[in-house]
């Protein structure tokens, strides 16, 4: 077996959700249902159990964020929520949904000067007044070696998109997140789906870039909804 | 430049050990991983494992898991694949490679010879 | 046996277009994971060819082009050279987390 699939390391790695096996079923291309991840010592397969629980919101999917399932709840104890669609309230980016950012407390769109939803997680940042650990997992802010004095160039390791270097976004590969291309007119990309064919996120693409969207290639219409490719086009 | 530069090719009989290195130069070792890779004589290629030079998290393939050990010296930039009872089987050329979104820099590779 | 699955052999004249296939599952290709592709020159190390998304290093002609669809991905070189007779491998990754090659095919330049 791979050893520590998944470890604890935030520049590189998920951490494991409590009590589970690493990694949480968020929406991405890369859905594998049902395969198996060490958690702990011994392999356990993987469920789209709910709530998930998480000390963190890169623990969770790309269209959900960390947090206390009620207003002034129990601090030690958070799940996956959805996020915050545009106009709505946040405290914090990872709040809002793909695409946009929190700015003065409204999720609003992301332009090319802010982050994007679907990539960055903000780790360093807490939910308000909750506590920044959780049973022992720490937002572990501290990079110590990883952290870099220029911009990452393609392939290096990172932990949010300014670490890389324009045209580059902060995408999990793997075993780590990478800087990974900002994707082109014409190339694969992800649609991210709200509801079912939820995996593990183990592999993310960066968004389309500027003027281009995520849309169903043309002629992929007619395929089943399973196998229709998404392409970067001009709006 | 970037440059990959393995340690030259080695005979050995089978039980003995060996440690073989990937010299790297031309860019930051500690952000990038280093991959390893097999390639058995007329054969294709084989991933062997992976390694993070900044924290030397290391990930391997589940054929080669308990075969090899994979390490690295930061303060040498230079990343190591070593055996402790080598087998004939063993018999490779054997290359390093830097893991970006691929294998995108190779070394040169390191030919392994076992013979009793 | 190799995860993906590529032909041994293809072969073509100066100037022709050849493919080379490289044949996964829901795992792997299917899963919507990369595919790279490396050339290996006689006596040589591997050499990336293209990576990812349709992207290629520096230095790389675009005579050279990749596609991928459902579970199946491909390389397709045109205006064939006699300098491009080499090996050429595909790869992946697994759901497992492992690195997965494709078994290598020897492009012959008539």
């Known amino acids: 077996t791979l050893n520590s699939v998944l470890n604890s390391n935030a520049i590189k790695n998920l951490p494991p959700p409590l009590g589970g096996a690493a990694g949480h079923p968020g929406s991405a291309v890369s859905a594998a249902p049902g395969i198996l991840y060490p958690g702990g010592n011994k392999y356990q397969t993987i469920d789209n159990y709910q709530p998930y629980p998480c000390a963190e919101d890169e623990e969770c999917g790309t269209d959900e964020y960390c947090a206390s399932p009620t207003r002034g709840g129990d601090a030690g104890v958070q799940i996956c929520l959805a996020c915050r669609k545009r106009r709505k309230r946040c405290m914090r980016h990872a709040m809002c949904c793909p695409g946009n950012y929190c700015k003065n407390g409204i999720c609003v769109s992301s332009d090319q000067n802010h982050f994007r939803g679907e990539i960055e997680e903000t780790i360093t940042e807490s939910f308000g007044n909750d506590h920044s650990t959780l049973d022992g997992y720490s937002r572990r802010t501290t990079l110590s070696s990883k952290m870099y004095h220029t911009k990452g160039q393609e392939g290096s390791v990172c932990l949010r998109s300014s670490d890389c270097a324009s045209g580059l976004c902060c995408a999990r590969h793997f075993w780590s997140k990478i800087c990974k291309p900002v994707l082109k007119e014409g190339q694969v990309c992800t649609k991210h789906r709200r509801k079912g064919s939820h995996g593990l996120e183990i592999f993310q693409r960066c968004y389309c870039g500027e003027g281009l969207s995520c849309r169903i290639q043309k002629d992929h219409h007619q395929a089943s909804n399973s196998s229709r490719l998404h392409t970067c086009q001009r709006h | 430049e970037v440059q990959l530069v393995q340690s030259g090719a080695e005979v050995k009989k089978p039980g003995e050990s060996l440690k073989i290195s990937c010299k790297v130069s031309?860019?930051?070792?500690?952000?990038?991983?280093i991959g390893w890779v097999r390639q058995m004589p007329g054969k294709g290629l084989d991933w062997m494992g992976i390694i993070y030079p900044g924290d030397s998290d290391t990930r391997y393939s589940p054929s080669f898991q308990g075969q090899v050990t994979i390490s690295a010296d930061k303060s040498i930039s230079t990343a190591y694949l070593q055996w402790s009872s080598l087998k004939a089987s063993d018999t490779a050329m054997y290359y390093c490679a830097r893991q970006g979104i691929a294998f995108d820099y190779w070394g040169q590779g390191t030919l392994v010879t076992v013979s009793s | 046996q190799s995860v993906l699955t590529q032909p041994p052999s293809v072969s073509g004249a100066p100037g022709q277009r050849v493919t080379i296939s490289c044949t996964g599952s829901?795992?792997?290709?299917?899963?919507?994971?990369?595919v790279h592709w490396y050339q290996q020159l006689p006596r040589t190390a591997p050499k990336l060819l293209i990576y990812?998304?349709?992207n290629r290093p520096s230095g790389v002609p675009d005579r050279f082009s990749d596609s991928k669809s459902g579970t199946s991905a491909s390389l397709a070189i045109t205006g064939l050279q006699a300098e491009d007779e080499a090996d050429y491998y595909c790869q992946s990754y697994d759901s497992s987390l492992s690195v997965i090659f494709g078994g290598g095919t020897k492009l012959t330049v008539l």
């Open positions: 990812g998304n349709s």
């Open positions: 829901s795992s792997n290709i299917g899963a919507g994971y990369d």
């Open positions: 031309g860019y930051s070792f500690t952000t990038y991983w």
